[in-house]
Every structure is written in C-alpha cells, then in structure tokens.
C-alpha cells in the first residue's frame, strides 16, 4: 500500500492503492548537496548522476570507521524520497548529487558555497530546464551562505532547504533563514510537528511550510534493494523538492515567486497543532503542510497572496520592523502586531525602488512585527496614498482617487505614544468602501493598485463585546489582500492575514474589562483578477 507520506501529499482525486501522480517531474533536474550516495540502489539507479564534486571536512575522532553504507545513508535516502521509482515523490525527475557532508553528516559553509558555485557554473556552461537545488542541511546563521543562496535564486534556480532539527527558530540557522530559499519544517502522520529525541523540527517566520518528515520510507544504502525509515526536516525538504520538480515540469516557466505562492496555496491549511510550538512563535509559524496541486495545470487564473512577517523590532522606543516581499511580488497591504499592544502602527514606504512594510514600536512596548501581504499581480501599478493626521473629529480618511485604481490595503501610523481609550470609534461612512479611515491623530495610508481586471471589495466583521480575536474571511474565488482593524479599538494588538482570513487580535478581555471601547471590527479587503481568469481560459 502507499506510504503515508505519499498519500498525505496527494490530492484526493489522485488517491489510489499506488502513488501515481500525473507528471513525474521529467523536465526538471534536482541537485542534491548532501553525503555521498549509493547510486546503484535499484530505487535510484539511472535517475541520479553522481558528480565529481566533493568538498567535505575530515571525520572527527581517531577511532572513526568509514563504512560505505553509513557514509551514503543520508544522501541515498533523500535521493529516494525526491525521485525514487518506488517511494519517491517526483518519479520522473533526474538528480545530480554533490558531496558536501562527510560520513558523520558534517559539512562546512565553505564546502556548501563552493558546491553552489559549481551548480551556477554548470548552469552557465550547459543550460538545461528548470533547476531545483535541495539543501538538506542546517548550520548556524551565515550571512555569506544566505547571500550565495540569494544569488543562485536570482539566477532562476529554486532552492529548497531543511528548517533544521533543533526545535528552535529557523531564522537562527542557514540556509533556512535566507528569504529566497523555500524553507521546510517537518510534520508526522498525525500532521503534528516532528519530535526528534529531545529536539524536533524548527519553526518560526523563516519556515515557508511543513511537509512529511517522520518515518519516511526510502532507499537504504545498506543494500541494492534495502529500504529504511528516516525522520527529519531533510526528509520534509526532499518532499517539497519533489513537489516543486513536478510543478515546474508541468509549468516550466514558473518563477520562484510563483512556485512559492503555489506551494503555499495548495498546502493543507490549519492542520498542525500549534500548541507544540513556543507560544511566541505560534503566530509566526505557517500552519501549512505541503501537497501536490489537484491539477498540474490551470492555476494561473488565481490571485495568489502570502503573508510575510518581519523580524521582531526589539523593545527600544523608536524601534521599527520591516517586512519585504520577494522581487516578483507586489506589496498590497501592510499591518503590524505587538503582544503588549503598545505600537505606533505601520506604514508602506519605498526602499530601493520597492515598497516595504514598516511597523513602529511605542514607548513601553516590548516590540512590534511588520506584516506584509505579498501578492502575484502581473502588470500591476501600485502606489501609496497618504493622509496626514486630520483636525476634524471625523478622523482621517484617504481613498484611491486615480482612475482605475482599487484599494488593496489600509495602514495607519501615529506619532503620539498612545491614542488613548477615551476617543470614540470612527465609523466608516456607508457607500464609501474605497477608502481607509483612521484616528484623527493618525496618518492613514491606502495601497492603491491598477492591474488588468483587478477588482476588490471591503468586508467587515464587527463584534460589540470584547473578544480576544475577531476574524473575517474572503469567500471562494476572492483573495485576501488587506487586513486591518477599524479605529476606536484601543486595545487592539494588531491585525494579520492567515491564508484567506483577516485576524484582529485584542488584549486579554480580563485585563481590559468590558467597556464601550470593547467593540472590535476586522476589515478584510478581498480581491480577484478577472484578467488572470480570462487569460487561463484562453490557454486551455
């Protein structure tokens, strides 16, 4: 019968006793940077080409006994998970292996860097189809390794890496912390985060998604027909590399940004028990388990968006946090979040010719996060319209006044330390959905975009009594681009998007008490692109 991990990543319409996905990734080459491998294992023979690249440190210990099957164990298993003919994800993908880890599974930053350079040169000498690079390794944070990954990604290569097995914030490790890399955490058959002894999968904002990574059956280097179970984020990353190979084989022109958005979009949502993660990491960690798309074609009509969290600003009074979208993505909205509730909002601003989302800490605050909503919107022309603090008691408002521009997000930012609880809520005038509204002491920023066929609408959900969390979701066929709270709710900790749902978080009700200011309204801006829908219909 089908191994649990292959069943888990398979959409229901393809499920059978045997794993037989529609396209095996035959147009894609996957580079594996790992240990040596047993290339004559019948699971991978003829599918994996062992390059002559080897850059590994000496094994530790004088009594270390180099046994071939042990040296090959990790790499052979991963090659099998990616493209094995029996238990592999992308059965048609061809692979090339580079040895950067020694028989004890240890490597160096320099060895990995030279390996990445080897791939870049190979790509220049003999350009092939789409390339996926699997980096099933994790070490301490390395600026130079992250930069090398960025360079390769910008050359059109898809890099997939393990989040790490340290039960820690993945942002503290490389290459997991490189924004251009697709970073994968591990889950088990119950869709729970994988525990490995006293440790387990890494987590946090640097993880893009999770994938099966416990009791994964794959080729064993013990013998030509041997199989073995292994666990870890390396195995999880191998699943995503396989899924990526299949997606790229079906749509070879996909960019890294498009691929990442599709991986997120087609993942199983909200199935992971977040209680496993440290409390402060739960909101930052994506609740996504990788899966193959239900169809390898025809996803182009969708407006894809993802949420990108910044690093924590730190607690200093003027501290700020910045969240950035990938080069091919548009920043359609910006929000902020603070666990203490002390923040001075957020704004979208230009930086290096691109919009970024900046959140501001407040005096006495423990720090803030900036949350960017990053979307794929071809031929988009977006700008930010700002209204300075208003004198009028009606509050500050700003709208998209350019012809053909629609509102995709609202942000507000204030200079005063505390907007105070005595100010009455500002209600949005009915019939004027294309504008952002805020406190009179706040400057308001509207994200206004023009793109072919783009249409957006505002959806609100208000709760009169105090609630720790208020949500509003976009309906089927619409994508959440903006998420904010209506002003007047001074105890709001912030707003952020989780998949297609806008979440507004408030202070613990028991500490705020029930007052007239208890009302919380979550405001979602939901968009769709008729142009993308028409384009995909024409292609079919």
């Amino acid at each position: 019968s089908i191994p649990w991990n292959l069943e888990r990543i398979t959409p229901p319409r393809y499920r059978a006793d045997e794993y037989q996905p529609p396209d095996g990734g035959s147009l894609v080459e996957v580079y594996l940077l790992d240990t040596s491998i047993q290339s004559d294992h019948r699971e991978i023979e003829g599918r994996v080409m062992v390059t002559d690249f080897e850059n590994v440190p000496e094994e530790d210990g004088t009594r270390f006994h180099r046994q071939a099957s042990k040296c090959d164990s990790h790499g052979t298993h991963l090659a099998g998970v990616v493209s094995g003919r029996d238990a592999g994800v992308a059965k048609g993908a061809s692979m090339r292996s580079l040895r950067v880890l020694n028989c004890q599974g240890k490597g160096t930053v320099s060895g990995t860097l030279i390996g990445l350079e080897f791939i870049r040169k190979s790509q220049l000498v003999q350009p092939v189809g789409p390339l996926v690079v699997l980096l099933p390794l994790a070490g301490g944070y390395s600026r130079v390794l992250n930069a090398a990954c960025q360079r390769l990604a910008r050359a059109g290569v898809v890099l997939v890496t393990a989040a790490g097995n340290f039960r820690d914030d993945a942002c503290l490790y490389s290459p997991a912390s490189a924004p251009e890399v697709i970073t994968v955490g591990a889950t088990n058959a119950q869709d729970q985060p994988v525990t490995l002894g006293t440790l387990g999968t890494n987590f946090g904002r640097c993880v893009d998604l999770f994938a099966p990574g416990e009791d994964i059956i794959g080729a064993s280097s013990d013998c030509s027909t041997c199989f073995v179970s292994q666990s870890g984020t390396s195995q999880a990353a191998a699943h995503v590399a396989g899924i990526a190979a299949m997606m790229l084989s079906a749509e070879p022109e996909l960019t890294l940004a498009e691929l990442r958005q599709r991986l997120i979009h087609f993942s199983a949502k909200d199935v992971i028990n977040e209680a496993w993660f440290p409390e402060d990491q739960r909101v930052l960690t994506p609740n996504l388990v990788a899966a193959l798309p239900p169809s390898t074609h025809g996803a182009g009509w969708q407006l894809f968006c993802r949420t990108v969290w910044s690093a924590h600003s730190g607690p200093t009074r003027m501290a700020t946090a910045v969240a950035r979208c990938a080069p091919d993505e548009e920043l359609l909205s910006c929000s902020s979040f603070s666990r203490s509730g002390k923040r001075r909002g957020e704004r979208m601003e230009a930086q290096g010719g691109k919009l970024v989302c900046r959140a501001h800490n407040a005096f006495g605050g423990e720090g803030v996060y900036a949350i960017a909503r990053c979307c794929l919107l071809p031929q988009a022309n977006c700008s930010v319209h700002t209204a300075p603090p208003a004198e009028a008691s009606m509050g500050t408002r700003v709208h998209c006044h350019q012809q053909g521009h629609v509102l995709t997000g609202c942000s507000s930012h204030w200079e005063v330390e505390d907007l105070g609880t005595h100010k009455p809520p500002v209600l949005r005038p009915r019939g004027q959905p294309n504008q952002c509204v805020g406190h009179r002491e706040a400057s308001i920023h509207a994200s206004c975009c023009h793109a072919p066929g783009l249409e957006c609408k505002v959806k609100e959900h208000g709760i009169p009594a105090p609630q720790e969390q208020v949500t509003v979701a976009c309906e089927e066929g619409w994508t959440l681009t903006g998420c904010s709270a209506l002003p007047g709710t001074s105890h709001v900790l912030g707003a952020y998007a989780v998949d297609n749902t806008c979440v507004v978080r408030s202070r613990d009700v028991s500490t705020t008490g029930s007052t007239s200011e208890g009302a919380v309204t979550a405001v979602a801006i939901c968009c769709r692109s008729r142009h993308l829908a028409q384009a995909s219909q024409e292609l079919q």
Epitope: R42, E43, G46, S73, R85, G92, D222, C223, T225, F227
Partner: antibody, heavy 119, light 113 residues
C-alpha cells in the same frame, strides 16, 4: 486475481531471434518489478535480470548482459525477454516473476515458457 | 556476487518426520538499518514454477502451511518442514535478494523415504 501469463513454448533454430512475453493482470503493473529467471533442463534457478515497467529501468546479471534484452510495454502490462541470435545452450524454461519495493522477492510467478533451440 | 550454498543436495525423510535444509550465504544478508535478513525460500514441484514459501528468512507467505518454518540470521539459515507430507516432495531453493545479481542456492531435493 493477480497473475502473470507467459507466452507459449517455442522451438527455434540456432541463430534465429525470439521474443517471449509475460502479461501481468490484477495489479498495478507499473509499480512492480518483473524478474526473469532461467532454468536449464535438470538444473537450478538462475536470475537473469529485472525491469521496472514504470520507467523501463533494467538491471542484468553480468552473465546474461549482452546475451538477452529485457523490455516492457506498460500500456499493455507486458514484459519481454528477447534474443537476437539463439544458441543451443539457450534451451531452457524461462520464468517471469514480480516483486515490489516493500517485498523485493518473487511472490507471483508466471507458468513458464519452454524455449527449445535445436538444429 | 553473493554465493548461496545449500546442504544437503538431496534429502529422504519418512512421512510425518522432520526435514531440515540449510543455506549459507558468502556474506551477511542481515542489514542493520531495518534489522531484516534478505533471504527467501521457494518450493518447486516437477513441471511447475517456483512458489514462495518464506521471506525475510522467517516470515511465512500467506496460504503456506505452518509446518514450514524458516530460521537463521546473517549468513546461516534453515528451512524446516516439521512433519513431511507427500505433497511436500519438491526441490527447495534459498535466495538472497539484497544485492545484484540476485542469487539462488543450487537446490535441495526432498523425497520420501
């Protein structure tokens, strides 16, 4: 039910070519390996080689490499064993059998094809 | 290649008596990663294809009578027929399936005394 049905007995002259077949049914043919085994008259079993019909990956016993060709047509769930130039020493019973990655031994066998090569 | 050697070449046992066949591999077929012995036993009756009896050295194939049992580990293995029946007259082969080329023992012929 799961079965492998082999083509009928063949009588050939030395130097002639031959292709015998093995058709699988009752299971997912592309997800199992097909093994070919030779048994010369009054002798034991010899493993000749293997094919994975999913991608036509083959592995031969060095003893038979270059002497025979193993192939498969997954569209009709059939594996083949062929000779381009038969020799008298090829006279034997040839069996096909299937195996799976989780059970890499031969759990189902064909009935056998007797090949006689004589001038 | 892994060489499989069976003993004896032939064996005559009275009905209802125990028959024991040995098989030795030239190198271990036990693998530490999954703690399995990659060894199978087959029965071949005259004019029939071989039939799987035992795999992983000691696991009986479904439908095989429980008088057949396999034991051993590493390089030394045994097939035991606890109470020989008339229908057990056949040639028995051991096989290692861990390494290419896959190899069989030369066979042990079991007859009734």
């Amino acid at each position: 039910q799961v079965q492998l049905v082999q083509s009928g007995a063949e009588v050939k002259k030395p130097g002639e070519s031959l292709k015998i077949s093995c058709k699988g049914s009752g299971y997912s043919f592309t997800n199992y390996y097909i093994t070919w085994v030779r048994q010369m008259p009054g002798r034991g079993l010899e493993w000749m080689g293997i094919i994975y019909p999913g991608d036509s990956y083959t592995r031969y016993n060095p003893k038979f490499q270059g002497q025979v060709t193993i192939s498969a047509d997954k569209s009709i769930s059939t594996a083949y064993l062929q000779w381009s130039s038969l020799k008298a020493s090829d006279t034997a019973m040839y069996y096909c059998a299937r195996d799976h990655w989780s059970k890499p031994f031969s759990d189902v066998w064909g009935q056998g094809t007797l090949v006689t090569v004589s001038s | 290649d892994i060489v499989m050697t069976q003993s004896p070449d032939s064996l005559a046992v009275s009905l209802g008596e125990r028959a024991t066949i040995n098989c030795r591999s030239s190198q271990s077929v036990l693998y530490s990663s999954n703690n399995k012995n990659y060894l199978a036993w087959y029965q071949q009756k005259p004019g029939q294809p071989p039939k799987l009896l035992i795999y992983w050295a000691s696991t009986r194939e479904s439908g095989v009578p429980d008088r057949f049992s396999g034991s051993g580990s590493g390089t030394d293995f045994t097939l035991t027929i606890s109470s020989l029946q008339a229908e057990d007259v056949a040639v028995y082969y051991c096989q290692q399936y861990s390494s290419f080329p896959i190899t069989f023992g030369q066979g042990t012929k079991v007859e009734i005394k």
